[in-house]
């Protein structure tokens, strides 16, 4: 089918984009769509004494309900939406008047949709329309046995024994403009290494320090040993799963899918089939013996509520095939449209370097929030979140961590996946405004019950204070309950209280806690806050109180199912400008709850930022006397000295972002 | 846009000689593994050479192990095949393949080995 023409009647203005529909271009291409007009009732040369009304030109994107309009050019003049700076031109105008061809930059997958371009002249309007697909998916790939084993040959076959081939540059920038973040570093096709990190941390810094982009190694010696990214294309064909009660075994996932009319899938097929919506709550063998499962919809239950293509592991460090005695179900492939390169075709065999990739696509809605963490490129110890529990890698070993996979025996893991989403850095430099120095904060001292923020830790999470409102005491038992909820926690426990006290944490304000009791944790007894307790360090109760009268409650956040972010511009915020601001960058405010938790896990900033309460505060994980006072712990700024008061929502701050 | 554009097919007798051509654009050709495949009439693709993106390691089929020859020019995104002492059951559709998707090869190039 070629391009959709509409105009109201036939002697008026034609607008024609002389292309097929849909129009199929690989990721990290560029793409020029050609669109021409007629307009037989204007005609270009009109009297010198009058002033020619130039035709309008806008092209727009449609896609999932949603237009953009990406540029409009009238009188020789081009308007570029600003989100498409250096993305989208007239190649041809304003030197042919009449030529609104377009032309689109390092295509995403985002880029897909359906192109319209309008001509408005007078009173007339005209349009015709193209849809573009853009194809194909990066991925990283790492062979089974540990990180960084493969030079640029091994690596090359790792993707076309996969139904892939190496990525390109262009198409790893495009993926990261997807949203694409995995800290390992990896091969691509004109022989450099390169990776792509959206929220720069200690190891995965490279050549870039504190900013966002892809990192690079530059052009490296064929025989270094890195992972790879790859880069599947398309299929024509179809992956589906196989089962039976008992599951099968490598061979007989193999022989099932054969009677079946169809092969074991790839890797880059499955990809493929994940990136087309496909989801699949059980793990199967594919056809390089790794076992993995793709998951479009994130769920609790189903590889710790993350998307992408998970793998299952033998051991904890993530390494090691399932035996290929073990049962899981059969992804099959069927179509004619890839043929199996024989392993003497690279002039080995075996499985020395059969490979598994890591990673999770970001830039999908999720209805929760997202589990986000990362490995190193080059080695440190990963904090990560809500596993049903965890090891504390060495430094030799990949840095992920791993949660049950689902049907599983008890011996396999299910990666988590070595990714974090796009978030919004501080641009590079501190701004000025209100300096959590100068501002009253209070003196919370919120120790993480079971360990000190960059520490390896068990499970646990963090008992916090809350008064969410500008007035102390206020919170009846039931609004304490939904307080801690709306802040993305729950109320906390005497049992989790009493482990916070004992990992230091102090606070003398009464709070609600989970069996109606009500207690505050003292390290340190001074006069008004002795409590039941004397001069003795120790939780101090009120006992079970009526549910009708008011404190402040403790809240219990379990583990970050996200990635808090800070954000900035010059002029900061508003509280109104922060919601706005963060979801116009697929995320929200952060919830208090999510701010102590990424607190939990390392995220220190001596900038006071909005939260989703209307609360201002600040994390700080490494105290030094600027960054409000010597203990670590999440600063809160109140209006008044005794600590009361939220501050005004038209005063301009920083905020902090979830997503 | 990546294409692949095959040449040097032809009719030919036992015991001669073809060299296949393959002109490569739209992809970096120097970083990437090339390969000849070839698909005789009513039968499966089968796999013939493949070439490293250096050039420095290349490998055979055995059916046409010692006759055939894989050859690169990075220079000019060029692939080889040297073809000597052709047989009848050489006659095929003769594809340039850097992946394994059929649908990113080239159009192919007929070699018919006749007498």
């Known amino acids: 089918a070629v391009t959709v023409e509409t105009s109201d009647h036939d002697n008026s203005l034609s607008v024609s984009i002389p292309q097929p529909s849909p129009l199929r271009v690989l990721l990290g291409t560029s793409l020029t769509i050609p669109c021409y007009f007629i307009d037989p009732m204007h005609p270009v040369t009109t009297a010198p004494s009058t002033a020619p009304l130039a035709p309008r030109i806008k092209w727009s994107r449609v896609s999932k309900e949603k237009e953009v309009v990406l540029l409009v050019a009238t009188e020789g003049r081009v308007r570029v939406n600003s989100a498409y700076q250096d993305k989208v031109s007239l190649p041809n105008y304003p030197a042919i008047p009449s030529d609104a061809t377009l032309e689109v930059q390092s295509l995403r997958s985002n880029d897909s949709g359906v192109y319209r371009c309008e001509v408005m002249h007078g009173i007339e309007d005209s349009e015709a329309t193209l849809e573009v697909v853009v194809k194909g998916i990066v991925f990283h790939y790492r062979a089974i046995s540990t990180r960084y084993t493969l030079d640029f040959d091994r690596a090359q076959r790792a993707c076309l024994q996969n139904s892939a081939i190496i990525a390109t540059p262009e198409q790893l920038q495009a993926a990261y403009e997807d949203g694409f973040h995995q800290c390992d570093a990896g091969w691509l096709a004109d022989q450099t290494v390169r990776y792509p990190i959206h929220t720069p941390r200690e190891g995965c810094y490279g050549d870039k320090d504190e900013f966002p982009g892809v990192r690079t190694y530059g052009i490296r010696d064929t025989n270094e040993t890195y992972d790879v990214y790859c880069f599947a294309e398309e299929m024509e064909g179809e992956v589906f799963y196989a089962t039976s009660p008992e599951k099968f075994t490598f061979q007989e996932a193999a022989n099932e899918c054969r009677r079946l009319g169809a092969r074991l899938a790839t890797t880059g097929q499955l990809y493929l089939a994940w990136q087309a919506g496909m989801d699949m709550c059980s793990a199967g063998w594919l056809a390089d013996r790794s076992v993995r499962y793709p998951i479009s919809k994130a769920r609790p239950n189903c590889g710790g509520n993350l998307l992408g293509v998970r793998t299952v592991y033998v051991h904890a460090n993530q390494t090691g095939y399932p035996d290929p005695s073990s049962r899981y179900d059969a992804i099959c492939y069927t179509g004619e449209d890839f043929v199996d390169i024989p392993e003497n075709f690279f002039g080995v065999g075996g499985e020395e370097d059969i490979t598994v990739q890591t990673v999770t696509w970001p830039d999908m809605e999720l209805p929760l929030p997202r589990n986000i963490t990362e490995g190193e490129a080059r080695g440190s110890v990963i904090l990560t979140v809500k596993p049903i529990f965890e090891v504390s890698p060495s430094p030799l070993e990949p840095e992920e961590p791993f949660t049950f996979a689902p049907e599983i025996g008890a011996t396999a893991f299910a990666e988590v996946e070595n990714e974090t989403g796009e978030a919004t850095r501080p641009w590079g430099f501190p701004t000025p405004g209100l300096g959590p120095a100068t501002a009253f904060t209070s003196e919370d001292l919120v120790v993480q019950v079971t360990a000190v923020p960059g520490q390896p830790h068990l499970p646990g999470g963090v008992v916090f204070h809350y008064r969410p409102g500008p007035t102390r005491y206020s919170l009846t038992f039931e609004e304490a309950q939904q307080a801690c909820l709306r802040t993305g926690a729950v109320i906390a426990s005497p049992e989790q209280l009493q482990a916070a006290y004992e990992a230091g944490y102090e606070q003398c304000d009464a709070g609600w806690l989970r069996d109606q009791t009500v207690r505050y944790p003292i390290v340190s007894p001074r006069t008004p806050c002795v409590g039941d307790k004397d001069s003795s360090p120790g939780v101090r109760t009120y006992g079970v109180r009526p549910s009708t009268e008011t404190y402040d409650v403790y809240c219990f956040v379990d583990r970050l199912e996200g990635e808090v972010f800070f954000a900035t511009r010059l002029e900061q915020f508003t509280f109104q400008e922060a919601l706005e601001f963060c979801e116009s960058h697929n995320a929200t405010l952060a919830t208090t709850g999510q701010l102590y938790a990424a607190w939990s896990r390392g995220l220190d900033k001596c900038y006071a930022g909005w939260l989703a309460d209307g609360s201002l505060r600040y994390p700080i994980v490494t105290p030094r006397p600027a960054c409000g006072g010597d203990k670590p712990g999440v600063r809160t700024v109140y209006l008044y000295p005794n600590q009361t008061g939220l501050p005004d929502p038209l005063s301009r701050h920083h905020a902090f972002c979830f997503r | 846009e990546v294409q692949l554009v095959e040449s040097g097919g032809g009719l030919v007798q036992p015991g001669g000689s073809l060299r296949l051509s393959c002109s490569a654009s739209?992809?970096?050709?120097?970083?990437?593994?090339m390969f000849w495949v070839r698909q005789a009439p009513g039968k499966d693709y089968e796999w013939v050479a493949s070439?490293?993106?250096?050039?420095?390691?290349?490998y055979y089929d055995d059916s046409v192990k010692g006759r055939f020859t894989i050859s690169r020019d990075s220079a000019k995104n060029t692939l080889y095949l040297e073809m000597n002492n052709l047989k009848p059951e050489d006659t095929a559709l003769y594809f340039c393949?850097?992946?394994?998707?059929?649908?990113?090869w080239g159009q192919g190039t007929q070699v018919t080995v006749s007498s």
């Open positions: 393949a850097r992946s394994p998707r059929v649908g990113s």
């Open positions: 739209g992809f970096t050709f120097s970083g990437s593994w």
């Open positions: 070439i490293n993106s250096s050039g420095g390691r290349t």
